[in-house]
């Protein structure tokens, strides 16, 4: 069983009258790290954008979706080397002539400032300081995300010790 396949989970005490439910715990799979309500996997190896998209899918996740500038900054703060870049889940839709997230939504003009061409076969990557477009066929590291999901785990109180 692969360590990266398991779902991220939040174990929460939903019914506080039941003393056998575990207190709040946040958990991401091995190799993944928690960033607020997401589990992120920063790849070590490299892939074209489409292969990165597929790899995240096999891990029951998606390429990173960035909601706002704050999330971009939080993610960039986890990139410790200026020379390293990561694909995210944003590419150029030729038919709609706009940047499109893999969830189907379009890039809002005030979300991210992308340096580079907006044209066919352009995909977006982030570095420590910036957001760029590049040919989707370029091999790069990538970031997968999983949304944290709610799980109720009942355990005996003495296992909290």
């Amino acid at each position: 069983q692969k360590p990266s396949i398991g779902k991220c989970s939040v174990d929460i005490q939903q019914n506080r009258t039941k003393t056998t439910e575990r207190p709040d715990l946040l958990n991401c799979p091995i190799y993944w790290q928690q960033v607020q309500e997401k589990c992120l996997l920063f790849s070590h190896t490299v892939n074209p954008w489409n292969n990165s998209l597929a790899d995240c899918s096999t891990k029951e996740s998606s390429l990173l979706l960035i909601q706002d500038k704050d999330e971009l900054t939080r993610t960039q703060n986890l990139i410790h080397d200026k020379a390293i870049s990561f694909w995210i889940g944003l590419n150029f839709s030729l038919s709609e002539k706009n940047w499109k997230w893999i969830n189907g939504s379009f890039l809002s003009s005030n979300d991210l400032k992308i340096t580079g061409d907006a044209k066919e076969n352009s995909c977006v990557y982030i570095s420590q300081t910036s957001v760029y477009s590049e040919y989707c066929s370029t091999e790069m590291k990538w970031i997968c995300q999983k949304e944290l999901t709610l799980v109720r785990n009942k355990v005996s109180p003495d296992s909290w010790l």
Partner: antibody, heavy 121, light 107 residues
Framework: EVQLLESGGGLVQPGGSLRLSCAAS????????MSWVRQAPGKGLEWVSA????????YYADSVKGRFTISRDNSKNTLYLQMNSLRAEDTAVYYC??????????????WGRGTLVTVSS | DIQLTQSPSSVSASVGDRVTITCRAS??????LAWYQQKPGKAPKLLIY???SLQDGVPSRFSGSGSGTDFTLTISSLQPEDFATYYC?????????FGGGTKVEIK
Amino acid sequence: EVQLLESGGGLVQPGGSLRLSCAASGFAFSTYAMSWVRQAPGKGLEWVSAISGVGGTTYYADSVKGRFTISRDNSKNTLYLQMNSLRAEDTAVYYCAKPLDSSLWADFDLWGRGTLVTVSS
Amino acid sequence: DIQLTQSPSSVSASVGDRVTITCRASQGISSWLAWYQQKPGKAPKLLIYYASSLQDGVPSRFSGSGSGTDFTLTISSLQPEDFATYYCQQASVLPITFGGGTKVEIK
């Protein structure tokens, strides 16, 4: 069955060439970066080279840079190591290895049996 | 390159003994350390990955700990089949590097 099977080793003179092959089966070969690792007789493990899943990115240990070339044919599920200008110190068992996760270069959970390369006059 | 220094280079122990092997990295590697077991004439076998995660099928007497630069592999109760050579390996950055190995011998 999930396995890796190396071939192509043998006895070669210093300055000569050999091409090693590693046939993969039982897993999605093209989605994994692959590596060659070697072990000289009675010595420890030494990573030699790695290649990305689609084959466009390669890395080499300093000791083999400029002499060895790693490649792959995903249509044949096969990994290669072309070894030129061989030296006595390249004598070793050569293993191909697959990482545990498709996002990694290392943490090798699958190894071949190895193929022995002997460089001697 | 990141150097990994294993100690001891060899250890003599008896069945049932607790054996501890250490691996020190020349710079911080977070938890990106794996441990392998190798027997003569055989390929290495992954025991522990990401410093402390037990690989599928590996007995629970094997455990790993540590982060940053200092790591430990512990065999809680040595069994006859555990006499072998053990290697640490870092997966933090390329080039991938291995420790020099620790041979666990019968006392």
